[in-house]
Interface confidence: low
C-alpha cells in the first residue's frame, strides 16, 4: 500500500526492499532486447559478425566516436589476430552474459564492443533470461524468508519479553532485520503476539538502539494495511506517541512517519492519537528544524484538527498558533509551508484560535507567501487570511500584505481574486491606516477594475464593493477615493449592480457605496445620469412594501431575505437619496418620482435609523418651496413634531430642520411658536435661544455623518449568513471546507462561516454601543 510519497522523503537510512530489485525490471524502462517487442529482430548473421541494422544507434555518432577514440590504424595481420581471439572466446562471452556467476575469478574475456557504455549483442540477448533467473531467485528467497520468519517469530517474541535487557536488545535487532524483507515482514504482522511484544519493548526500553530498532520495525510494518491494523490493535498508538518525546532523531522520525501512516489509512487512529496526548507532543515538536520532519508533523496536526473542535483547542492550549506562524516566517521548503498553511487554515475557523494566530503575526507571515510560485500554497494562505481577516482589523504592520492583496486583484485566477477582495474588505473595515494604505497603493483603481472584470460573479463583486464602500468613508483619503471611483470609470458599473441579477447582499453593499460616493459633489450629476435615483427609489419602494406586507400579516420579527433585512434596504436607499438630495437637480428628480408620501410614511417607522434618514432626506427636499409645501400637504407636521422629542439627536435635529423650513412662508406668530417648541425640544439639557434660526440644518451632516454620530465609535457587529459557495472554490476535496472570511452583505468584518454557535459570544464581547447612532451604511461600523 503506497503512502504519501512526497511526505516520506525523510533522510533515514532505510534498507531498500528485496522486492524493489524485482520490480525494477518489471516497471522501470530498460533497453528493449527485441524479445518483447520484436522491434529489432532481423535474420541472424551467418558470419557471426553481427547485423549492422541490429544496433539501434545513430551511425554518425558511432563514426564520430571511432574517429575520436582510435587514432592508430591496424594492419591486416592484427585484424586477423583479433578475429581469431574473438572466435576462441565466443562460448565464454555467451556464458559470461547468461551465467556470470559461473566464471572463474579474474578471467579476462575480450569484448566485442569498443564502447563500454553499449552492451554487446550477446549481452542484450541475455537480458530476458537474466530477468527470469532473478525472478526465480527472488521467489525462492521469498519462500525461504517466509519459512525462516515463521519458525523464528515465536522464539523472537519470547526473547523480546525476556528479563535480560541484552537479550531483548539482540532480539530487537533481529526482528528489525526481518522486517526489512517482504516475506518475513508479512509473517511479523500476522503475529499479534510479536507486534505486541515490539510495541511493549519500544515503550519500556531505556536503550537507544532497542528503541530505534523497534520503532523502525513498526515503521516498516506501517506501509501495509495489515501492518497498520496490527499496530493499532496492539496498542501501538499510545506507545508511538510516547516515542515522540524521544531525544533520538531516528526514533522520533520513525515514530512520526508511522503515526502519519496510521492517521492516513487506519480507521480509529485519529481518536487514539488524540486520547494518547499526541497533539501536545506534536505541537512541542514544531521547534525542530528538519523541514521534512516538520512537514510530516504538521500534516499529522492537520489530519487531527480537521473537523474536530477539541483538537483545535488542544493545539491552541499547547502554543500551536505561535509555532505554526514561526514556521511560515522561517522556512522556504514548499511542502512544509503548504502543510503548515493547511493546519492554519483549519485553525482559522476556530473562534478561539483565530485571535491567537492573528496576535502571533499570522497575517503578516501568511502574506509573505502570496507571491510564491506554488498555487496550492498561495490559495491556502489566501483562504486562511480571509478567515482571519475579520479578527485582524486592529493589527499593525499590514502594509506589505495590503500591497500584495491589491496586486492579486489583477490575477487571472478567480479564486485568488475572490479571496483578495474579501480580505481587503475586512481589513479596510474600521481601520483608517489600512484604508489610507490601500488608497495609496492604487487600491481604488484595482477594485474598480476587479468589479468591471467580474461581471455578475457576486462572490467577487460583493466584497469588492464593500471594500470600496469602506475606502470612500471616514479617513483622510476618503474624498480622493470618492473621486477616484468616478475617474476610473466605476460609476456606470456601480449603478448597474443595483439592477438584476444582483442579489440583496450585493445591492445593500452597492447602496452604501453610492451613499458614500454621493458625499462628493462631483459625483452628483454622473450618478443621476446613470439612473441611480430611479433605481434607488424603486428598491426603496419594493423593500418598504415587503416590510409593510409582513407587518400587516402580524409579523413582528424582522425577516431576512438572502441574509439581508428589508429594513436595512429601506434605511440604505433613503440614506443614499438623502445625500444625493444635496444637489438641486437631484432633488427635482427625487421629488418627481413621487417619493414625498413614502418619506413621510417612513417617519412613523419604529426603527430610529429609518426615522433619521427619512427626516434627513425631507430636510434636504424642504429647501425647495414646492417640496416643503408637498411635505406639509402629506401631513408630515404631526410625525415631525413627535420626532422632536426623540432620544436620537440626529432624528430630532432633522425633524426640527424640516419643520423650520416648512414654516418659511408662515406668519410670524406661527414661526415664534415653532421656535419656542423647537428650543424646548432640542435644548432640553442646555436651554438657550436659537441664534440665526435661518442657518438651522445647513451644516447638518455636512461631512456625511449625521449629528450625534460618533466618529470614533470602534464597535462593529460580526455575524454569519449565506457565504461563499464553497463548492465553487475549487478546493482539494480533502481540505476542510471551513471557509469563511468575507460575508456577503455585511458592513462589518466577517467571521468564518461554519462556527455559527459562536456568533452570540462574539457579540457579547463587544463594548455596549448606542445602536441608534450606528447607521448601517456608515460603511464600517
Amino acid at each position: 500500500m503506497a503512502t504519501q510519497a512526497d511526505l516520506m522523503e525523510l533522510d533515514m537510512a532505510m534498507e531498500p526492499d528485496r522486492k524493489a530489485a524485482v520490480s525494477h525490471w518489471q516497471q522501470q524502462s530498460y533497453l528493449d532486447s527485441g524479445i518483447h517487442s520484436g522491434a529489432t529482430t532481423t535474420a541472424p548473421s551467418l558470419s557471426g559478425k553481427g547485423n549492422p541494422e541490429e544496433e539501434d544507434v545513430d551511425t554518425s555518432q558511432v563514426l564520430y566516436e571511432w574517429e575520436q577514440g582510435f587514432s592508430q590504424s591496424f594492419t591486416q595481420e592484427q585484424v586477423a589476430d583479433i578475429d581469431g581471439q574473438y572466435a576462441m572466446t565466443r562460448a565464454q562471452r555467451v556464458r559470461a552474459a547468461m551465467f556470470p556467476e559461473t566464471l572463474d575469478e579474474g578471467m579476462q574475456i575480450p569484448s566485442t564492443q569498443f564502447d563500454a557504455a553499449h552492451p554487446t549483442n550477446v549481452q542484450r540477448l541475455a537480458e530476458p533470461s537474466q530477468m527470469l533467473k532473478h525472478a526465480v531467485v527472488n521467489l525462492i528467497n521469498y519462500q525461504d524468508d517466509a519459512e525462516l520468519a515463521t519458525r523464528a517469530i515465536p522464539e523472537l517474541t519470547k526473547l523480546l519479553n525476556d528479563e535480560d535487557q541484552v537479550v531483548v536488545n539482540k532480539a530487537a535487532v533481529m526482528v528489525h532485520q526481518l522486517s526489512k524483507k517482504e516475506a518475513s515482514r508479512h509473517a511479523i504482522m500476522r503475529s499479534p503476539q510479536m507486534v505486541s511484544a515490539i510495541v511493549r519493548t519500544m515503550q519500556n526500553t531505556n536503550d537507544v538502539e532497542t528503541a530505534r530498532c523497534t520503532a523502525g520495525t513498526l515503521h516498516n510494518l506501517s506501509h501495509h494495511r495489515e501492518g497498520l491494523l496490527a499496530i493499532f490493535k496492539s496498542g501501538g498508538i499510545p506507545a508511538l506517541v510516547k516515542m515522540l518525546g524521544s531525544p533520538v532523531d531516528s526514533v522520533l522520525f520513525y515514530a512520526i512517519t508511522t503515526l502519519h501512516n496510521l492517521l492516513l489509512h487506519q480507521e480509529g487512529a485519529k481518536m487514539a492519537v488524540r486520547l494518547a496526548g499526541g497533539l501536545q507532543k506534536m505541537v512541542a515538536l514544531l521547534n525542530k528544524t528538519n523541514v521534512k520532519f516538520l512537514a510530516i508533523t504538521t500534516d499529522c496536526l492537520q489530519i487531527l484538527a480537521y473537523g474536530n473542535q477539541e483538537s483545535k483547542l488542544i493545539i491552541l492550549a499547547s502554543g500551536g498558533p505561535q509555532a505554526l506562524v514561526n514556521i511560515m516566517r522561517t522556512y522556504t521548503y514548499e511542502k512544509l509551508l503548504w502543510t503548515t498553511s493547511r493546519v492554519l487554515k483549519v485553525l482559522s475557523v476556530c473562534s478561539s484560535n483565530k485571535p491567537a494566530i492573528v496576535e502571533a503575526g499570522g497575517m503578516q507571515a501568511l502574506g509573505l507567501h502570496l507571491t510564491d510560485p506554488s498555487q496550492r500554497l498561495v490559495q491556502n494562505c489566501l483562504w486562511t487570511l480571509r478567515n482571519l481577516s475579520d479578527a485582524a482589523t486592529k493589527q499593525e504592520g499590514m502594509e506589505g500584505l495590503l500591497g500584495t492583496l491589491v496586486q492579486l486583484l489583477g490575477s487571472d485566477d478567480i479564486n485568488v481574486v475572490t479571496c483578495a477582495a474579501g480580505i481587503l474588505s475586512n481589513l479596510t473595515c474600521n481601520n483608517y491606516k489600512n484604508k489610507m494604505m490601500v488608497c495609496q497603493v492604487g487600491g481604488i483603481e484595482a477594485l474598480v477594475r476587479t468589479v468591471l472584470r467580474a461581471g455578475d460573479r457576486e462572490d467577487i463583486t460583493e466584497p469588492a464593493i464593500c471594500a470600496l464602500r469602506h475606502l470612500t468613508s471616514r479617513h483622510q483619503e476618503a474624498e480622493m477615493a470618492q473621486n477616484a471611483v468616478r475617474l476610473h470609470y466605476g460609476l456606470p458599473v456601480v449603478v448597474k449592480l443595483l439592477h438584476p441579477p444582483s442579489h440583496w447582499p450585493l445591492i445593500k453593499a452597492t447602496v452604501g457605496l453610492i451613499r458614500n460616493l454621493a458625499l462628493c459633489p462631483a459625483n452628483h450629476a454622473p450618478l443621476r445620469e446613470q439612473g441611480a435615483i430611479p433605481r434607488l427609489v424603486q428598491l426603496l419602494v419594493r423593500a418598504h412594501q415587503d416590510t409593510q406586507r409582513r407587518t400587516s400579516m402580524g409579523g413582528t420579527q424582522q425577516q431576512f431575505v438572502e441574509g439581508v433585512r428589508m429594513e436595512e434596504i429601506v434605511e440604505g436607499c433613503t440614506g443614499a437619496l438623502h445625500i444625493l438630495a444635496r444637489d438641486v437637480h437631484n432633488r427635482i428628480v427625487i421629488r418627481g418620482l413621487n417619493t414625498i408620501p413614502l418619506f413621510v410614511q417612513l417617519l412613523y417607522s419604529p426603527i430610529e435609523n429609518i426615522q433619521r434618514v427619512a427626516a434627513g432626506v425631507l430636510c434636504e427636499l424642504a429647501q425647495d418651496k414646492e417640496a416643503a409645501e408637498a411635505i406639509e400637504a402629506e401631513g408630515a407636521t404631526a410625525p415631525l413634531t413627535e420626532l422632536l422629542h426623540s432620544r436620537n439627536e440626529g432624528v430630532a435635529t432633522y425633524a426640527a430642520a424640516v419643520l423650520f423650513r416648512m414654516s418659511e412662508d408662515k406668519p410670524q406668530d406661527y414661526k415664534k411658536r415653532l421656535s419656542v417648541e423647537l428650543t424646548s425640544s432640542l435644548f432640553r439639557t442646555e436651554p438657550m435661544a436659537w441664534n440665526e434660526t435661518a442657518d438651522l440644518g445647513l451644516d447638518i451632516g455636512a461631512q456625511g455623518e449625521p449629528l450625534g454620530y460618533r466618529q470614533d465609535d470602534p464597535s462593529y457587529r460580526s455575524f454569519h449568513s449565506g457565504g461563499y459557495g464553497q463548492d465553487a472554490l475549487g478546493m482539494d476535496p480533502m481540505m476542510e471546507h471551513e471557509m469563511g472570511g468575507h460575508h456577503p452583505g455585511a458592513d462589518y468584518p466577517v467571521d468564518g462561516l461554519p462556527d455559527l454557535g459562536h456568533a452570540q459570544d462574539l457579540m457579547d464581547g463587544l463594548p455596549p454601543g448606542d445602536s441608534n447612532q450606528l447607521a448601517w451604511f456608515d460603511t464600517d461600523l
Epitope: G277, Q280, A284, E310, L313, I314, A317
Partner: nanobody, 118 residues
Framework: QVQLVQSGGGLVQPGGSLRLSCAAS????????MGWYRQGPGKQREFVAS???????NYAASVKGRFTISRDNAKNTVNLQMNSLRPEDTDVYYC????????????WGQGTQVTVSS
Amino acid sequence: QVQLVQSGGGLVQPGGSLRLSCAASGSISSNNVMGWYRQGPGKQREFVASITDSDLANYAASVKGRFTISRDNAKNTVNLQMNSLRPEDTDVYYCRLTMMTYPPTISWGQGTQVTVSS
C-alpha cells in the same frame, strides 16, 4: 469543579532560590498537563514550564537550566524549583492545569508574587 491552590513565592535576592507549589483538587482527568506561567504588570502572560502526566517536561528558553518542574501524580501536585534567580524573573506566577478531556478545560491558580531584588 477543579481548584488549584498555590503556595511559595516571596522576596529573594538575585542568585537565590525559591520553590513554588501547586495542589489540584476536584475531578481531575488522568490525561493532563500542569504548568507555570508568569505575568508582570501591563505584560502578556508568558509560559515558564510544563510537565505532562507522563513526566515530559518543557521549559521556556529563558529559564532552561535554572528552573526545574516536577509533579506527583498521586497527590496531583506540581512544583517549580527556581534557582539562580534574576531580577527579570520578578512577576506574578500562575499555576495552570490543562485537562485534555472532551472538551479540554483550563484551570488557573490564584497567583503568587515572586520578587527578585537586592
